[in-house]
C-alpha cells in the first residue's frame, strides 16, 4: 500500500506527536525515522492513529529490526501489537511477565488470535514451564486457556501452579486433560483438611480414579450432581450403591433425573436392583435378583 517517496520539505518528523495523524501513509513512511519511532514507542498509543497508519509504523520497525523487535520496543507496542503476524512474533524473545500482560491487555476485547497463541507459546517455552504467575495471568485473560493445551503441554505445569486455577478455567477441559491435571491438584492440595480439600479438588475430579472417589465417599462431602456427571465412567462403575449414596449425600435424589445419561446409566446397569431399590428413587435397569455377576475384566487379568 505504501510507496517509497521522498519526504516533502518541512515535514520530517522531529518527534512522535499528534501532528503525525494528518500525514498520509506515504508521508509517514517517508518522514518518520525508524530509530526515532523505536525510542519513542511509548508515545504512539497516546496518538489517535488509524490502524492503517499503525501499519506503516509497523513497516518502519520491521525494516529497523529484521531479526525481531527487542523487548524494549515490544513492551511499548500497545495496539500496534494487533498488527503483528504470528511470523513476526516468532522472532521475539519476551521474558517479562509485565510485557506479556501489556500485550494481552490490548487483545482483551477480542477473541484469542493466532498472534496471541504464538505470543503465549513463545513466552511459556522461554520460561521452560508454566509457572504460577504466568498461569495466573493467562487464565485471568483467557479462562479457557488451560483447556486449550494438550495433555503433553499440561504435564509441564508444576503442582504449585494449580493454586491459580479457578473452576471456570476447567469448563472446557476433556477427560484426557483432567487425567493430567488431577494428580497435580491432589498433590497441591494434599495438606488441606477434608471440606476445604473437597472445595479445591472438586473441579479436577473428572480425572479422579475409583479409589479416590471411594475415599471421598467416606468424608461426607455431598458432591453435587453436576460434578458427579463429569466423573470418568470407568471410575464410577466400580462404586457400590452405598458409596454413591455417601458421596452424593442429599444430592443422591438427583440420580433419578440423570438415569438415562452417562455415567449414571452405565453405573445403574452394574448395580443389583435390590441395592438400587434401597435408595427409594425408583431407579430401574439394575441386575435382577438371582443373577450371577461375572467380572470378566478380573478373569482376564488373572489369566
Amino acid at each position: 500500500e505504501v510507496e517509497k517517496t521522498a519526504c516533502p520539505s518541512g515535514k520530517k518528523a522531529r518527534e512522535i506527536d499528534e501532528s503525525l495523524i494528518f500525514y498520509k501513509k506515504w508521508e509517514l513512511e517517508a518522514c518518520v525515522d525508524a530509530a526515532l519511532l523505536a525510542t519513542q514507542m511509548d508515545r504512539v498509543n497516546a496518538i489517535p492513529f488509524t490502524y492503517e497508519q499503525l501499519d506503516v509504523l509497523k513497516h518502519k520497525l520491521d525494516e529497523l529490526y529484521p531479526q525481531g523487535y527487542p523487548e524494549s520496543v515490544i513492551q511499548h507496542l500497545g495496539y500496534l501489537f494487533l498488527k503483528m503476524s504470528p511470523e513476526d512474533i516468532r522472532k521475539w524473545n519476551v521474558t517479562s511477565l509485565e510485557t506479556l500482560k501489556a500485550l494481552l491487555e490490548v487483545n482483551k476485547g477480542h477473541e484469542m488470535s493466532p498472534q496471541v497463541a504464538t505470543l503465549i507459546d513463545r513466552f511459556v517455552k522461554g520460561r521452560g514451564q508454566l509457572d504460577k504467575d504466568t498461569l495466573d495471568t493467562l487464565t485471568a485473560f483467557y479462562p479457557g486457556y488451560l483447556c486449550s493445551l494438550s495433555p503433553e503441554e499440561l504435564s509441564s505445569v508444576p503442582p504449585s501452579s494449580i493454586w491459580a486455577v479457578r473452576p471456570q478455567d476447567l469448563d472446557t477441559c476433556d477427560p484426557r486433560q483432567l487425567d493430567v491435571l488431577y494428580p497435580k491438584a491432589r498433590l497441591a492440595f494434599q495438606n488441606m483438611n477434608g471440606s476445604e480439600y473437597f472445595v479445591k479438588i472438586q473441579s479436577f475430579l473428572g480425572g479422579a480414579p475409583t479409589e479416590d472417589l471411594k475415599a471421598l465417599s467416606q468424608q461426607n462431602v455431598s458432591m453435587d450432581l453436576a460434578t458427579f456427571m463429569k466423573l470418568r465412567t470407568d471410575a464410577v462403575l466400580p462404586l457400590t450403591v452405598a458409596e454413591v449414596q455417601k458421596l452424593l449425600g442429599p444430592h443422591v435424589e438427583g440420580l433419578k433425573a440423570e438415569e438415562r445419561h452417562r455415567p449414571v446409566r452405565d453405573w445403574i446397569l452394574r448395580q443389583r436392583q435390590d441395592d438400587l431399590d434401597t435408595l427409594g428413587l425408583g431407579l430401574q435397569g439394575g441386575i435382577p435378583n438371582g443373577y450371577l455377576v461375572l467380572d470378566l475384566s478380573m478373569q482376564e487379568a488373572l489369566s
Epitope: 500500500e1 498520509k24 488509524t50 482483551k108 476485547g109
Partner: antibody
Framework: QVQLQESGPGLLKPSETLSLTCTVS??????????WGWIRQPPGKCLEWIGS???????RYNPSLRSRVTTSLDASKNRLSLQLSSVTAADTAVYYC????????????WGQGTMVTVSS | QSVLTQPPSASGTPGQRVTISCSGS????????VYWYQQLPGTAPKLLIY???KRPSGIPDRFSGSKSGTSASLAISGLRSEDEADYYC???????????FGCGTKLTVL
C-alpha cells in the same frame, strides 16, 4: 463478546444539543478496543462518520461536524457519549456507535442504533 | 453527494455472481484500504470485507473484495435470497482526514 447499546432522546427541537450514550457490555471500555466510532444514517440516505474516540481519550472528528461535536469516555460507567450542538432537521438520523476489529479499521461490532428526530 | 460513488442498485438471480463497484479518488481508495458493509433492512451495518480483501470470521467465502487504482469492487458468488440488502463501501480519506462512505447499493435477488 462485546456488545454496544445506544440511548438518548428520540425527539429534539432545532438549536438544542443532542446527547447520546453508548453503553459497552462484555468488556472494559478502556481496554477492549483501540477506539470507538460514532456513525449516523439519515432516513434513506448514506452512512456518515461523525468521529472516533480512542481508549486514551484522544479524538478525531469529521471536519464538517467538528465545530459542533464532542465525544467522551466514562470508564466508571463503561460508556461513551456523543454531544452534537445546535441541531437542525439535517441532523435527523439513526445514530450508531461501533468498534473496529482487532488490528484493522473495519467496524466489526455495532450497536443497534437509536433514531433521533429534530423537528419544531 | 457522497465522496465514494456506488451504483444505486444491482440485481441477480439465485446462484449467480454479482459485482458492486465503488469509485473514489487518489486521496481515499487510491491510497488507503477499502471496507465493505452489508445492511439488512432495519438493522445495523455488518462488516463484510476489511483491508480491501480480507473477511472477518463468520463471513462466507462467497463474498470477496478487490481494489485497483481508485476503484474497488465487492463480488458475491452463489447469490442467495438472504443476500438481499444494502451494501456500502468505505475508506479513509487523507484530504478530509476522516472516514468516507459510499451511498450504498441496493441488491435485489430476483
Amino acid at each position: 463478546q462485546v456488545q454496544l447499546q445506544e440511548s438518548g432522546p428520540g425527539l429534539l427541537k432545532p438549536s438544542e444539543t443532542l446527547s447520546l450514550t453508548c453503553t459497552v457490555s462484555g468488556g472494559s471500555i478502556s481496554s477492549s478496543s483501540y477506539y470507538w466510532g460514532w456513525i449516523r444514517q439519515p432516513p434513506g440516505k448514506c452512512l456518515e462518520w461523525i468521529g472516533s474516540i480512542y481508549y486514551s481519550g484522544t479524538t478525531r472528528y469529521n471536519p464538517s461536524l467538528r465545530s459542533r461535536v464532542t465525544t467522551s469516555l466514562d470508564a466508571s460507567k463503561n460508556r461513551l457519549s456523543l454531544q452534537l450542538s445546535s441541531v437542525t432537521a439535517a441532523d435527523t438520523a439513526v445514530y450508531y456507535c461501533a468498534r473496529p476489529g482487532a488490528g484493522h479499521d473495519g467496524f466489526d461490532i455495532w450497536g443497534q442504533g437509536t433514531m433521533v428526530t429534530v423537528s419544531s | 453527494q457522497s465522496v465514494l460513488t456506488q451504483p444505486p442498485s444491482a440485481s441477480g438471480t439465485p446462484g449467480q455472481r454479482v459485482t458492486i463497484s465503488c469509485s473514489g479518488s487518489s486521496s481515499n481508495i487510491g491510497s488507503n484500504y477499502v471496507y465493505w458493509y452489508q445492511q439488512l433492512p432495519g438493522t445495523a451495518p455488518k462488516l463484510l470485507i476489511y483491508d480491501n480483501n480480507k473477511r472477518p470470521s463468520g463471513i462466507p467465502d462467497r463474498f470477496s473484495g478487490s481494489k485497483s487504482g481508485t476503484s474497488a469492487s465487492l463480488a458475491i458468488s452463489g447469490l442467495r435470497s438472504e443476500d438481499e440488502a444494502d451494501y456500502y463501501c468505505a475508506a479513509w480519506d487523507d484530504s478530509l482526514s476522516g472516514w468516507v462512505f459510499g451511498c450504498g447499493t441496493k441488491l435485489t435477488v430476483l
